[in-house]
Amino acid sequence: KFSKQSWGLENEALIVRCPRQGKPSYTVDWYYSQTNKSIPTQERNRVFASGQLLKFLPAAVADSGIYTCIVRSPTFNRTGYANVTIYKKQSDCNVPDYLMYSTVSGSEKNSKIYCPTIDLYNWTAPLEWFKNCQALQGSRYRAHKSFLVIDNVMTEDAGDYTCKFIHNENGANYSVTATRSFTVKDEQGFSLFPVIGAPAQNEIKEVEIGKNANLTCSACFGKGTQFLAAVLWQLNGTKITDFGEPRIQQEEGQNQSFSNGLACLDMVLRIADVKEEDLLLQYDCLALNLHGLRRHTVRLSRKNPIDHHS
């Protein structure tokens, strides 16, 4: 569970984060699992530990193995495992599957390809980007912060994209490369101002105190893959996660459906054990995309349980 795969190329920098988190003040000890040997913290070592991070500057094939990190909290020692594999550099242009990060998809409008793991490194812009080993040139390609933007994506843009950057550690520079596949969804789509199908504006939903209630926010955004589209719930103008009532939760993930060819999203708000104070809240279904934001407000009202008379 608290184990993470990491990989890199020999003679490049590799930085691995402990799969267990912790406060910055917590001590983190790293060990090479096979020998139980402690990883030094002195930066003069090629492989050294720096708090939550394990640094290979640069990495060698022989560094491959499982590393144990122990985060020492005031109450428990929490253990994580980093499974590190360092590969030899390929002589040809093909990047093997085992060096690939997760695939990303884009559509014809424009697409972002994030450089994987870059947030772990001390790097400075610009990033260099390559597709199938060729440096990317032309106005359609824009290296922006930690991602590549491709304008007017075409099916021919599918392929393997490699980002290359320099990690700086105490004045020394180390090269890092990371590759991921990019696929293009070939659909003639369009984007509209969001249309909320449910709930109706200013809808009053009847609920029973002490029972569970579900509210569904459903909206459509156009046809085909949407570059940016989201539906979410707010309580009294606050994000559900920030509102902090554990009884009220959004359903994990957004369900995507294609209704009459339209791209639609829905988000279910689950209210457990409805309480009187829930009736005082304002529930906002928000749908947003590049065109703008639409909001429908719902309020709850008490549904009196039906009395059964003989």
């Epitope: 569970k1 267990r20 988190q21 912790g22 406060k23 003040s25 985060v71 909290s73 005031p74 109450t75 428990f76 020692n77 929490r78 554990p246």
Partner: antibody, heavy 121, light 106 residues
């Protein structure tokens, strides 16, 4: 949603033991350590100890070491706190609690409803 | 053990008042958490990591401080804020709480 449901009130004689249960739901039981806090009538809060349901590892307030045992049953997502050699000053409400983000120890965001334990001859 | 000393032990204030509770630790701590407890109820987390507002907690509650001295503030007291408030450190074993501050309405 996260819920911690504790066992009912207990009345015990001095010298006896009491075992309080705390059944967790709404999250992956083994992902979060469970803590025990007690509160004597009209008094403040006192941390007793904790258990990691994944490993069974425990951490205790030295004040209770030797008298308190914490166990878990992963099949029922339940943790238990047993306090032995009870004395009258152990009369208190016993709470189980867990943090919002386990690894970051960011305060006890979730609490059981409490179990009143009365020690009286 | 790190002793936590809250002051005052009790205080009386009027609705709309700014209320401040302090918590002093016998040794330096990295973070402080604050709880509200109403009679017969389990404590409720209000502030974690010294100054972060717990989920769903009104913004009139705030926290600050570092080292050994920490402060909890209610910017404008509301009737529903009547409760006992506790500070808690999670920097060393055993975890310890302040003795509590009982807040009443004038």
């Amino acid at each position: 949603q996260v819920q911690l449901v504790q066992s009912g009130a207990e009345v015990k004689k001095p010298g006896a033991s009491v075992k309080v249960s705390c059944k967790a739901s709404g999250y992956t039981f083994t992902d979060s350590e469970m803590y025990w806090v007690r509160q004597a009538p009209g008094q403040g809060l006192e941390w007793m100890g904790a258990i990691d349901p994944e490993t069974g590892d425990t951490a205790f307030n030295q004040k209770f070491k030797g008298r308190v045992t914490m166990t878990r049953d992963t099949s029922t997502s339940t943790v238990y706190m047993e306090l032995s050699s009870l004395r009258s000053e152990d009369t208190a409400v016993y709470y189980c609690a867990r943090a919002f983000d386990n690894d970051n120890d960011d305060g006890f965001a979730y609490w059981g409803q409490g179990t009143m334990v009365t020690v009286s001859s | 053990d790190i002793q936590m000393t809250q002051s005052p032990s009790s205080l009386s204030a009027s609705v709309g008042d700014r209320v401040t509770i302090t918590c002093s630790a016998s040794s330096s701590v990295n973070y402080m958490h604050w709880y509200q407890q109403k009679p017969g109820k389990a404590p409720k987390l209000l502030i974690y990591d010294t100054s972060k507002l717990a989920s769903g907690v009104p913004s009139r509650f705030s926290g600050s401080g570092s080292g050994t001295d920490f402060t909890f503030t209610i910017s404008s007291l509301q009737p529903e804020d009547i409760a006992t408030y506790y500070c808690q450190q999670w920097s060393s074993n055993p975890l310890t709480f302040g003795q509590g501050t009982k807040l009443e309405i004038k």
